[in-house]
């Protein structure tokens, strides 16, 4: 996990998600996302 | 929640090969994705690779892309690693861990299940 820290004084931690797919629908593969402070992004 | 069983570890020569064996027990096992996890003296459980449900869709560590392949057999409950071309740092303890559908495959707290484990140990 990566971490950074801003000018705000807080740590905000990023970490990789990964995810099938398959279980969001019909597709294979995996589905990469990331999480910033708790919230996944993208 | 679904029973697991490791099997298959062992001491091998660098550049040899292990296939592990996960055995579940539950009726539910194809709700589940399946993922191995190692972890070695001193260091935390880290993410190997994982299979889908359905066991069309795979992922894996950097670490062991090219090298490993994960499997499963739904009819027979089973999970596989084929571990091939091993080096000294992959000797660890093995977990196989059961991930409920939607939840990050690469993370260890999406496991709700886990083995005890077997004991990989790559040396000359």
């Known amino acids: 996990d990566a971490e950074f820290r801003h000018d705000s004084g807080y740590e905000v931690h990023h970490q990789k998600l990964v995810f099938f797919a398959e279980d969001v629908g019909s597709n294979k593969g995996a589905i990469i996302g990331l999480m910033v402070g708790g919230v996944v992004i993208a | 929640e679904v029973q697991l069983l490791e099997s298959g570890g062992g001491l091998v020569q660098p550049g040899g090969s292990l296939r592990l064996s996960c055995a579940a027990s539950g009726r539910t096992f194809n709700n589940y994705n399946m993922g191995w996890f190692r972890q070695a003296p001193g260091k935390g459980r880290e993410f190997v690779a994982a299979v889908s449900r359905s066991g069309v869709s795979t992922y894996y560590a950097d670490s062991v892309k090219g090298r490993f392949t994960i499997s499963r057999d739904n009819a027979k409950n089973a999970v596989y690693l084929q571990m091939n071309s091993l080096r000294p740092e992959d000797t660890a303890i093995y977990y196989c861990?059961?991930?409920?559908?939607?939840?990050?495959?690469?993370?260890?707290?999406?496991?709700?299940?886990w083995g005890q484990g077997t004991l990989v140990t790559v040396s000359s």
């Open positions: 861990g059961a991930a409920y559908r939607g939840t990050a495959i690469n993370v260890r707290r999406s496991y709700d299940s």
